[in-house]
């Protein structure tokens, strides 16, 4: 059986947590880490469409960030492969009502955590 914890949503062998609270990007990742998870890593268009549909109209942080002049990277250190456009000039990415955008890390938003569902 798949083991998505209470309050997490299962989709394609992953579990997602959509916050009600708001935090900055760093604090959002710390929350996810406490749950043995990361800010969401989006691996397919189906996954992106699911997240956009499920999160509603609010902005939600995801696990993409960049240092000045550097490429976007996921939390796990892998480089972003331009699966979707990211608007804006910030260093951290979030999903809005149209797709992905970016903002400064200290701004507060809702967030999405993701982890693999652990089959037992």
């Amino acid at each position: 059986q798949a083991a998505c914890p209470e309050s997490w949503i299962g989709f394609q062998r992953k579990c997602f947590y959509f916050s009600d609270d708001t935090k900055n990007w760093t604090s959002s990742q710390r929350f996810c880490d406490s749950q043995d998870a990361d800010l969401a890593q989006v691996e397919s268009f189906q996954e992106l469409n699911f997240l956009l549909r499920y999160k509603g109209p609010s902005d939600h942080w995801i696990g993409l960030s960049r240092e000045q002049g550097q490429p976007w990277k996921w939390i796990n250190g892998t480089e972003w492969t331009r699966q979707f456009p990211i608007l804006g000039a910030g260093e951290c990415a979030y999903l809005n009502d149209k797709g992905a955008s970016s903002a400064r890390h200290y701004t507060e938003r809702k967030w999405i955590c993701s982890k693999s569902d652990i089959h037992v």
């Epitope: 929350f31 880490d33 406490s34 043995d36 939390i75 796990n76 982890k115 652990i118 037992v120």
Partner: antibody, heavy 116, light 108 residues
Framework: EVQLVQSGGGLVEPGGSLRLSCAAS????????MSWVRQAPGKGLEWVGR??????????DYAAPVQGRFTISRDDSKNTLYLQMDSLKTEDTAVYYC???????WGQGTLVTVSS | EIVLTQSPGTLSLSPGERATLSCRAS???????LAWYQQKPGQAPRLLIY???NRATGIPARFSGSGSGTEFTLTISSLQPDDFATYYC?????????FGQGTKVDIK
Amino acid sequence: EVQLVQSGGGLVEPGGSLRLSCAASRFTFSDAWMSWVRQAPGKGLEWVGRIKSKISGGTTDYAAPVQGRFTISRDDSKNTLYLQMDSLKTEDTAVYYCANRNLGYWGQGTLVTVSS
Amino acid sequence: EIVLTQSPGTLSLSPGERATLSCRASQSVSSSYLAWYQQKPGQAPRLLIYDASNRATGIPARFSGSGSGTEFTLTISSLQPDDFATYYCQQYNSYSRTFGQGTKVDIK
């Protein structure tokens, strides 16, 4: 039923090394973040460190007393977690447990005694 | 490093009584980052409560967790013979995940 079966404990002299193993079965080990926790005789629990899943980068974090001496690794092809302990001290004497915090799974524990 | 202090060190009660165990943090811990474990002699710990108030799978309803900030409580509403054990709180607010020193619940 989920199992975490530990091995590799024993008696070692101060300054010596030991490697503990934790073999996982009946869950998707490769997706799990795993931890080591220890308990000195008659004392409380002490977190040793943890390793993330490969998809989360496979990174490790350690408690201050073991940083630089202990190394956590994993072999997902063998469903096995490891704790390499080097430069062992008498105060490292404890029962060592492997665990998956998120699901509440724990190994049976293995005793490591550091003594001359 | 966040230090967790549990009190009392030992709690002597009779079966059927209510047990209230305290866990105080040296700095604020989000309620999402605190767990409680039960341990019996010679056994591995057992997860009781995660995220301060959520019961783990298979844990009876007599166990409940509450609190926020720096003060957290584990309550056992009516002690059963099987509940006499040592209880630990653990925080996972920081990347070093510390435990309290434990509270032993023994039979009066």
